[in-house]
């Protein structure tokens, strides 16, 4: 069956400053790919997070992703600001050249809220 | 006080197409997402069918697909389903959901409105 | 789609006795589990969210616990007014949205 990519969450409130997590798991680790997470649709979207190698400032990985059986690729934003007010998606892509998205989660609406 | 109120269930032949509705009142109805729950008489509960608050996003059972409409009229805080081609199983008392507004679970639920199908 | 299988069908008690449901998932809902009262006439009503969460107004005799795929709604002394059919609801995976068949608690 096709891989799907669950966000549990329709929307997280977080005040400015403070850390949220947003969650995401994977119902298969099949096909091999990378998954990536965006705020935005489009081709406009950023990219928050990469589970590879990359560092990205104030963006965690909740579990270890690097663990074979690991299905959970939830992210945790720290001190987060107005402007990483949002929809974030997790998305899975298929390996390739280039890599090919194939599944994405519903989104999670990101408020942020004054101190 | 949130509340919801279903009408335009009714005996209708099989077939034939019917449309309910929901007013709602008591909360920002656009915020929120809405979804029509159904229950056969005697059995469970069935979802069939959600629309985001903004109308964006629709999704419905399998059962119903391609056969029932959902729509919404935020300017009236009210809530439709178009039901055509109606068969004996859809014969049901269809309830109004109102969503959490973070997870998809039902805060509010109207009283319902019986649906018969039956020729 | 989640299927959600809720036992017993039917749990025959007294007032005052406690009252242990299932809800068995067929795939991990970590923690994403409603639980609803409806009594014969009525509409459902909201429990128990967040498989241990009570919902406002729910009175501490009734608790949730539970997750993965094993859950349990316990009423730790039956009221006259307990005496209804529960049921389950998913909200992990997006829709389709699934409830469990349902247990009728009713009175011995």
């Known amino acids: 069956t096709e891989v799907k990519v669950i966000q549990p969450e329709k929307s997280v409130s977080v005040a400015a400053g403070d850390s949220t997590v947003l969650n995401c798991t994977l119902t298969s680790l099949l096909p091999v790919g990378p998954i990536r997470w965006y705020r935005g649709v489009g081709q406009s979207r950023q990219l928050i997070y990469s589970f590879t190698t990359e560092h990205f400032p104030r963006v965690t990985n909740v579990s270890d992703a690097t663990k074979r059986s690991n299905l959970d690729f939830s992210i945790r934003i720290s001190n987060v600001t107005p402007e990483d007010a949002g929809t974030y998606y997790c998305v899975k892509f298929q390996r390739g050249s280039p890599d090919t998205e194939i599944q994405s989660g519903g989104g999670t609406e990101v408020y942020v809220l004054a101190k | 006080e949130v509340q919801l109120v279903e009408s335009g269930g009714g005996v209708v032949q099989p077939g034939r197409s019917l449309r309910l509705s929901c007013a709602a009142s008591?909360?920002?109805?656009?915020?929120?997402?809405v979804n029509w729950v159904r229950q056969a008489p005697g059995k469970g509960l069935e979802w069939v069918s959600l629309?985001?608050?903004?109308?964006?996003?629709?999704y419905y059972a399998d059962s119903v697909k391609g056969r029932f409409t959902i729509s919404r009229d935020n300017s009236k805080n009210t809530l439709y389903l178009q039901m055509n081609s109606l068969r004996a199983e859809d014969t049901a008392v269809y309830y109004c959901?109102?969503?959490?507004?973070?997870?998809?679970?039902?805060?509010?639920w109207g009283q319902g409105t019986l649906v018969t199908v039956s020729s | 789609e989640i299927v959600l299988t809720q036992s017993p069908g039917t749990l025959t008690l007294s007032p005052g006795e406690r009252a242990t449901l299932s809800c068995r998932a067929s795939?991990?809902?970590?923690?994403?589990l409603a639980w609803y009262q409806q009594k014969p006439g009525q509409a459902p009503r909201l429990l128990i969210y967040?498989?241990?969460s009570r919902a406002t107004g729910i009175p501490d005799r009734f608790s949730g616990s539970g997750s993965g795929t094993e859950f349990t709604l316990t009423i730790s002394s039956l009221q006259s007014e307990d005496f209804a059919v529960y049921y389950c609801?998913?909200?992990?995976?997006?829709?389709?949205?699934?409830f469990g068949g349902g247990t009728k608690v009713e009175i011995k």
């Open positions: 959901a109102k969503e959490n507004n973070r997870y998809r679970f039902f805060d509010d």
């Open positions: 008591g909360f920002t109805f656009s915020s929120y997402d």
């Open positions: 629309i985001s608050g903004s109308g964006e996003i629709i």
């Open positions: 795939q991990s809902v970590y923690t994403y």
């Open positions: 967040g498989a241990s």
């Open positions: 609801q998913q909200y992990y995976d997006r829709p389709p949205l699934t």
